[in-house]
Interface confidence: low
């Protein structure tokens, strides 16, 4: 048999297996070694009893999408039935006191194959043996503790394979510059340790995708904006938009990006080379927000001009050149660069928004029979923009991180926005008052940390014959500046 | 194998809360890259997504439905679970628990369960 | 939200014939040069089985006859030689974005 009779139906065109070499892969065209590395089809039934207690499931990662010329790393996981985890040595032990179907187990190992490999073997001092090598015959890479990797892992994609020993979570990272645009293939077969020979107990497969487009992701935040799973902000509040770019591995890391904004509200074109701008609408509507990102990344060298033909007599200097067929951005420059492009859209909705709270007086509310632990206690509260529809107070430790009461409750403010809230405070202290104002849209948030006195009769008859006191007979009032994100995450893959 | 198997009372009267749970086996719902979802399908009509629980416990609802709407977790007992309250009739529906890798597509379902909506 | 819309409602094939069934998104679902589009079979009383993911890709055990095509916001599911077996509701279903939506299914039936 061939890898590809084994690995899978994908068969590329030769043009994809000619222009898609993968550097230090092999071509699927070579020869399988059935008898070490045994092939079973889909249903067979041996695949049931290829691993003791159960199935192994390999989940199969990737990084994609990866801008061409990236690398893109794949992860192979494989996760064992329950109660059964890989130990220091790379044996396949019980997780101590775990209880599966079969009950708790005598036997510590599900596979020790430390033991098998002490016990076999007839090798010749070098650690060599015809069974230690991949399905195509190549020995087994000696790395320090090789012994304790005891699966062998084989990717295959583009028609060509790449085989990898390992322990239960492998990583292998391919470079794109050779490989066709859109979307591929990736298939892994795993194979297990047994005796002289292999079991494959998993396959896997998935999708992974290259692009000439850099993947470009947006999130986008602002104060007081209450849901962040909607495109909708509030106005003559900035918005901060913070681009992403999905290069996990670094390939634009010494490339120059230039960010080109357009707002969708007649504010023209802002260019930028920083990822964080802030934006704020001054009316409200549905607008189109546009993204170019443009960076200069590596790219294939041009090859160099064929040396020119011997003329009879001295040539002209040549006029312009003619219509390139490559796109702009597929020229490289003599610096072998390559100009990429990624883009971004997104329609926001702009309403009116409540967007500034202020307790602007704090007061002791006198009671005629006071409580032996109770103060009632009075905010008078401000807001800007819209009028709010709720008010939610949440009274906790002076860190503001232990909450001890909160409470909301729907209000009716007039044009003024002008409100009072009154909220019972059990025993002396000091206490973090947050006191949230919302509406549909938004969510305006303001803090104060208050001390709350002892109770004494003597204390409350005096406020009582000073007409009720201000903020500075009982209280000390300090304003925390406090403002809560809620960020807003475009959907991305 | 993995299997997800939907639990719940078949009968829910109007106005009450409909809940039901799926239980996981052949992998813990706590393995990179999988979400949970739940997606119901009314007798003789087409799927509705309702929401997910990623494994790392994030949670995402579809937003027709996001008002009533609570999937939770328990990881020690590998279930996941739907609360959807203020039930109408409009609400009877094959309840499907159902596995996501990633973004791609759903690929093992449970069996669903009926959930019908009378007084 | 994006909205799917399959045609035709009910088809009915020859044993043997191909039957082919369209899926229209009311937006783009390619993603970086991929369709997020997926094909599930549904029978009665079972859930839906995936046929195809990533437009063209075909699931774990699906026979060869199945296979799809497409891209932006037409795509196709194509059964090459109608077997008996493959009598069900075909649906289509996005899952580029939140929420993952479905198509309103094809019902195919032997002539």
């Known amino acids: 048999k061939r890898f590809h009779d084994v690995l899978g139906n994908e068969r590329p065109s030769a043009y994809m297996r000619e222009h898609n070499q993968l550097n230090g892969w092999s071509s699927d065209e070579n020869d399988w070694n059935e008898k070490l590395y045994p092939v079973w089809k889909r249903g067979d039934m041996r695949w049931k009893n290829s691993w003791k207690g159960g199935r192994v499931q390999a989940v199969l990662t990737s990084d994609s999408p990866a801008l061409v010329g990236s690398n893109i790393t794949f992860v192979v996981n494989l996760v064992f039935p329950r109660c059964q985890k890989e130990d220091a040595n790379g044996n396949i032990v019980y997780e101590k006191n775990c209880r599966n179907e079969a009950g708790l187990s005598a036997d510590p190992y599900v596979y020790n194959w430390t033991a098998w490999s002490e016990d076999s073997d007839g090798e010749n001092g070098t650690g060599q043996s015809h069974h230690n090598v991949f399905p195509d015959g190549k020995p087994f890479p000696h790395h320090p503790g090789w012994r304790r990797w005891n699966f062998v892992y084989v990717f295959h994609t583009l028609g060509q394979y790449f085989q990898k020993l390992g322990r239960c979570s492998v990583r292998v990272s391919v470079n794109t510059a050779n490989v066709t645009l859109g979307p591929q293939l990736m298939e892994v077969t795993v194979y297990r340790r047994h005796g002289r020979a292999y079991v494959p107990i998993a396959q896997v497969k998935d999708v992974y995708v290259v692009t000439d487009q850099i993947p470009v992701f947006v999130t986008m935040s602002q104060k007081n904006d209450r849901n962040s799973s909607d495109e909708t902000f509030l106005k003559d509040l900035p918005i901060t938009f913070d681009v992403l770019i999905h290069d996990p591995s670094h390939f634009l890391n010494y490339s120059t990006i230039n960010y080109k904004w357009s707002f969708g509200d007649n504010t023209g074109l802002f260019v930028s080379i920083n990822h964080t701008v802030n934006h704020t609408y001054v009316l409200n509507g549905t607008f189109s927000l546009n993204l170019t990102v443009k960076a200069a990344a590596p790219g294939p060298c041009p090859p160099p001009p064929p040396p020119p033909p011997r003329p009879p007599k001295p040539t002209p200097s040549l006029g312009p050149a003619g219509d390139n067929p490559l796109g702009l951005s597929e020229i490289p420059d003599e610096n072998c660069q390559i100009n990429r492009y990624g883009h971004f859209q997104a329609t926001i909705t702009i309403v009116e928004g409540i967007l500034e709270v202020n307790i602007i007086q704090t007061t002791d509310v006198l009671m005629l029979v006071p409580g032996p632990d109770s103060s009632l206690i009075d905010f008078v509260v401000t807001c800007q923009g819209s009028i709010p529809t709720e008010v939610c107070t949440i009274i906790s430790d002076p860190t503001c991180e232990i909450t001890q009461n909160a409470v909301c409750s729907p209000v009716d403010v007039d044009e003024m926005c002008l409100l009072t809230v009154r909220r019972a405070f059990n025993g002396s202290g000091t206490y973090c008052v947050n006191l949230t104002l919302g509406d549909d849209t938004s969510l305006a948030l303001t803090s104060t940390l208050i001390s709350v006195p002892d109770r004494d009769p003597a204390s409350s008859l005096r406020m009582a014959n000073s007409g009720g006191g201000g903020l500075n007979d009982i209280f000390e009032a300090q304003k925390i500046e406090w403002h809560e994100h809620h960020h807003h995450h475009h959907h991305h893959h | 194998q993995v299997q997800l198997q939907e639990s719940g009372p078949g009968l829910v009267k109007p106005s009450e809360t409909l809940s039901l749970t799926c239980t996981v086996s052949?992998?813990?719902?706590?393995?990179?890259?999988?979400?949970w979802s739940w997606i119901r399908q009314p007798p003789g009509k087409g799927l509705e997504w309702i929401g997910y629980i990623y494994y790392s416990g994030t949670i995402t609802y579809n937003p027709s439905l996001k008002s009533r709407v609570t999937i939770t977790r328990d990881t020690s007992k590998n279930q996941f679970s739907l609360e959807l309250s203020s039930v109408t009739a409009a609400d009877t529906a094959v309840y499907y628990c159902?596995?996501?890798?990633?973004?791609?597509?759903?690929?093992?379902w449970g069996q669903g369960t009926l959930v019908t909506v009378s007084s | 939200d994006i909205v799917m819309t399959q045609s035709p409602d009910s088809l009915a094939v020859s044993l043997g014939e191909r039957a082919t069934i369209n899926c229209k998104s009311s937006e783009s679902v390619d993603y970086y040069g991929i369709g997020f589009l997926n094909w599930y079979q549904q029978k009665p009383g079972q859930p839906p089985k995936l046929l195809i993911y990533?437009?063209?890709t075909q699931g774990s055990g699906v026979p060869d006859r199945f296979s799809g095509s497409g891209s932006g916001t037409d795509f196709t599911l194509t059964i090459s030689s109608l077997q008996a077996e493959d009598v069900a509701v075909y649906y289509c279903?996005?899952?580029?974005?939140?929420?993952?939506?479905f198509g309103g299914g094809t019902k195919v039936e032997i002539k």
């Open positions: 279903q996005q899952s580029k974005e939140v929420p993952p939506t």
């Open positions: 159902a596995r996501d890798l990633t973004h791609w597509y759903f690929d093992v």
């Open positions: 990533a437009a063209s």
């Open positions: 052949g992998i813990s719902i706590t393995t990179g890259n999988y979400r």
